[in-house]
């Protein structure tokens, strides 16, 4: 069993290294920013965020493109629930410093949790997304 675990670890690690999770991050950031816009923030106000979508993106086309690419990436983890969890954790971790305030963080987390389902994939069971912004140790 230990040998299998070790191989499983390595396989997941190399899957994660190969995966481009950036579209997922972009899709989620755009989604929560669109939600904020619908609550009255000026959609065209300048932003320092490199992921800040263009007005074109805000109409949804760019975002659906990101979602499609994101789902293609996540599909690689469909048969490895633990690795799917690690991928979601990585997305959370990568964005945790960019999220402004507790509310935005909760919103991002909520959207992240729904992501596998949006992609028609199984959500990983017992997956802890409570990542502190100090980073998580890799194995």
């Amino acid at each position: 069993r230990q040998q299998w675990e070790l191989q499983g670890d390595r396989r997941c690690q190399s899957q994660l290294e190969r995966a481009n999770l950036r579209p997922c991050e972009q899709h989620l950031m755009q989604k929560i920013q669109r939600d904020e816009d619908s609550y009255g923030r000026d959609p065209y106000s300048p932003s320092q965020d490199p992921y800040s979508p263009s007005p074109y993106d805000r109409r949804g086309a760019g975002s659906s493109q990101h979602q499609e690419r994101c789902c293609n990436e996540l599909n690689e983890f469909e048969n490895n629930q633990r690795c799917m969890c690690e991928a979601l954790q990585q997305i959370m971790e990568n964005q945790s410093d960019r999220l402004q305030g507790r509310q935005q963080e909760q919103q991002f987390k909520r959207e992240l949790r729904n992501l596998p389902q949006q992609c028609g994939l199984r959500a990983p069971q017992r997956c802890d997304l409570e990542v502190e912004s100090g980073g998580r140790d890799r194995y």
Epitope: R1, D9, R82, C85, A123, R126, C127, D128, E130, D137
Partner: antibody, heavy 123, light 110 residues
């Protein structure tokens, strides 16, 4: 008030069988994962088995897989543990517990415990 | 030997603070939620903390939980003699498809 009452514990010979029962009351049994946990005399806690709300998924400790069977009767609010080919290593107090695991993004936790029932395997 | 490592014993004086660590790996604590239990002598265990940091109703805020990477910690402040007990951490292990318990820590209030 949530209550979990175990029964069926006994002194049994190595190689023998035993069926533990756990009568649940005070909550909607069919909406919770349920779990058996055991504790050998003077030792720590050891998880034995989990069963999903509808009984469709079961997980077992490696050393009991193939020998033990966890099952439930939601109509009667009863949890069972059928134990076969028992050995001295299976001796201990067996606890019936309610497991708070709900969805993909929550964890296993045992928020209500029975009083425990003693199983002794000895010749 | 347990896969989750806890110190066998800790001790402190009444009113003091104590922490109990629980160390695991990426396949268990690193990915999954941790819970903590108190077992007073001769009784069934009682849930203290679930999902890393949450307290069930009725558990005083003297008890707290945290998690960082592949380790979790239970904190107890304002120690009382009634806190003398065994404390266990638990989590799911994704590789073993099993719940793991730590070996337990005996808390002595001096």
């Amino acid at each position: 008030e949530v209550q979990l009452v175990e029964s069926g514990g006994a002194l049994v010979q190595p190689g023998g069988s035993l069926r533990l029962s756990c009568a649940a009351s005070g909550f909607k049994f069919s909406t919770f994962y349920m779990t058996w946990i055991r504790q050998a005399p003077g030792k720590g806690l050891e998880w034995v088995a989990n069963i999903k709300q509808d009984g469709s998924e079961k997980d077992y400790l490696d050393s009991v897989r193939g020998r033990f069977n966890i099952s439930r009767d939601n109509a009667k609010s009863v949890l069972y543990l059928q134990m076969n080919t028992l050995s001295a290593d299976d001796t201990g107090v067996y606890y019936c517990t309610r497991n708070g695991l709900q969805d993909s993004y929550s964890g296993d936790f045992f928020d209500h415990w029975g009083q425990g029932i003693l199983v002794t395997v000895s010749s | 030997q347990s896969v989750l490592t806890q110190p066998p014993s800790v001790s402190a004086a009444p009113g003091q603070k104590v922490t109990i660590s629980c160390s695991g790996t990426g396949s268990n604590i690193g990915h999954n939620y941790v819970s903590w239990y108190q077992q007073l002598p001769g009784t069934a265990p009682k849930l203290l903390i679930f999902d890393n940091t949450k307290r069930p109703s009725g558990i005083p805020d003297r008890f707290s939980g945290s998690k960082s990477g592949s380790s979790a910690t239970l904190g107890i402040t304002g120690l009382q003699t009634g806190d003398e007990a065994d404390y266990f951490c638990a989590t799911w292990d994704a590789d073993l498809s099993a719940v793991l318990f730590g070996g337990g820590t005996k808390l002595t209030v001096l």
